[in-house]
């Protein structure tokens, strides 16, 4: 016998659908209504042949009873071909949920998503999180996407975008988000993110996340945020190849002194990068390839430094300097 | 190890009704989601009708507006009311708990619709 595709835990709390035949039973995803965190993989499915079977213009409000009665807080949904009418109609249903946290990974969105109706209320997710999601429409994906949801949303994860820069002047502000991650977008680079930082759309940013999204130097981040007007109070720059030495030509920067928290590990980094802020609560500068203890003078004024990991540390080789503050323990970099 | 035992099948005219039942017994702790399955003869197993552990419930397309699936006040009991019964519902009705790991299947019963 074939394995049931969806398992629903005993505490009737986490449900995980894999549907991966050519013609799934879909109703085996029911037992995840009364989970609340649920997942549902689709395989590479084509979704197309249920706008036939759902009418994705019908009121939402028949269906508002039911879906008030789900539990589902966390929502994953992956590996398909959506049609943009279909998750339109997912998004409207969904909107009288108690949904939180919606991510969607590996999707390939065909169409154009339809505008709001004036009677349709949004979904008030405060995270969103999409993973090699795909869009027809290119650019305008981000505020097609937006307004179908309630301006209330705190955190956005974008990664492995195809179209990682939005078209700003159709976006609204995001008044409440407070944490942006573009990670995964290699080939973001600093141009790419004065792209995707919209200006003046992201008033409240704490937490900016640019892992792995090629980019070459703190100074040219910092660029791009002045450019942008976000300031965030943590910003994590790991795992790109950083270069430590900034252009000549390049205008001098100056970081927010909203910025206490800086995260430069697996960079590369051989010396401690200039133009780094003068002053930071947390530097991490864990596994890098730092030879020698960095000299005060080559740091901004910090409390919480991280050197973990640098082959200045490694036993047998040169001592840390005295007041470098790290854990004793060796991190597997 | 949870059994599932049906009840309630049998031999009816067209258009007339029947009520089947379904008691799961053994080591369930919770209450789960479970459902009401059919096999025709010579035909696939089908969803019929399911009901959520909070209550929520769901219906095959042939059925919808005909049969009602609710709980019993026991932790585990499920009913099926079947009406304006028509000869394409004639199969054997197998009972379904949702339980991590692997399902509980019931032996089934027969529903024979008589034209």
């Known amino acids: 016998t074939t394995p049931e595709p969806c398992e629903l835990d005993d505490e009737d709390f986490r449900c995980v659908c894999n549907f991966s035949e050519p013609q799934p039973d879909w109703s085996e995803a029911f037992q995840c209504v009364s989970a609340v965190e649920v997942e549902i993989h689709a395989g590479g499915l084509n979704l197309e042949p249920f706008l036939k079977r759902v009418d994705a213009d019908a009121d939402p409000r028949q269906y508002a009873d039911t879906v008030k009665a789900l539990r589902v807080r966390r929502l994953t949904v992956g590996a398909a071909q959506v049609p943009a009418q279909l998750l339109v109609g997912a998004l409207r249903v969904l909107a009288y949920s108690r949904l939180k946290e919606l991510t969607l990974e590996d999707l390939k969105i065909t169409g154009t998503m339809p505008p709001l109706p004036l009677e349709a209320t949004g979904l008030a997710l405060s995270s969103l999180r999409l993973r090699n999601v795909s869009w027809a429409t290119g650019r305008s994906w981000l505020a097609e996407l937006q307004q179908w949801l309630k301006p209330g949303l705190k955190v956005l994860s974008i990664a492995q975008a195809h179209s990682p820069a939005f078209s700003c002047e159709q976006v609204r502000a995001f008044p409440a988000l407070t944490s942006l991650d573009l990670s995964d977008n290699p080939g973001l680079g600093e141009r790419g993110l004065m792209a995707a930082l919209c200006p003046h759309k992201f008033p409240a940013i704490q937490n900016l996340a640019l892992r792995n999204t090629g980019m070459e130097t703190p100074t040219g981040v910092c660029a791009a945020l002045a450019a942008a007007g976000v300031q965030p109070h943590s910003l994590d720059l790991s795992h790109n190849s950083l270069r430590a030495t900034v252009n000549p030509s390049a205008p001098r920067c100056m970081w927010s002194s909203a910025l206490n928290s800086l995260n430069l590990s697996f960079a590369g980094l051989e010396q401690v990068p200039k133009g780094l802020p003068a002053k930071l609560r947390v530097l991490d500068l864990s596994c890098n390839r730092l030879n020698r203890a960095p000299q005060p003078d080559e740091l901004p004024e910090v409390d919480n430094l991280t050197l973990d990991g640098n082959p200045f540390l490694v036993p047998g080789t040169a001592l840390p300097h005295e007041g470098s503050m790290n854990s004793g323990v060796v991190p597997a970099c | 190890q949870v059994q599932l035992q049906e009840s309630g099948g049998g031999l009816v005219q067209a258009g007339g009704s029947l009520r089947l039942s379904c008691a799961a017994s053994g080591r369930i702790f919770s209450i789960r989601p479970m459902g009401w399955y059919r096999q025709p003869p010579g035909k696939e197993r089908e969803m019929v009708a399911q009901?959520?552990?909070?209550?929520?419930?769901n219906y095959g397309d042939s059925v919808k507006g005909r049969f009602t699936i609710s709980r019993g006040s026991a932790r585990n009991t499920v009913y099926l009311q079947m009406n304006n019964l028509k000869p394409e519902d004639t199969a054997v009705y197998y009972c379904?708990?949702?339980?991590?790991?692997?399902?509980?299947w019931g032996q089934g019963t027969q529903v024979t619709v008589s034209s």
């Open positions: 379904r708990l949702f339980k991590t790991g692997a399902d509980s």
């Open positions: 009901i959520s552990s909070n209550g929520i419930t």
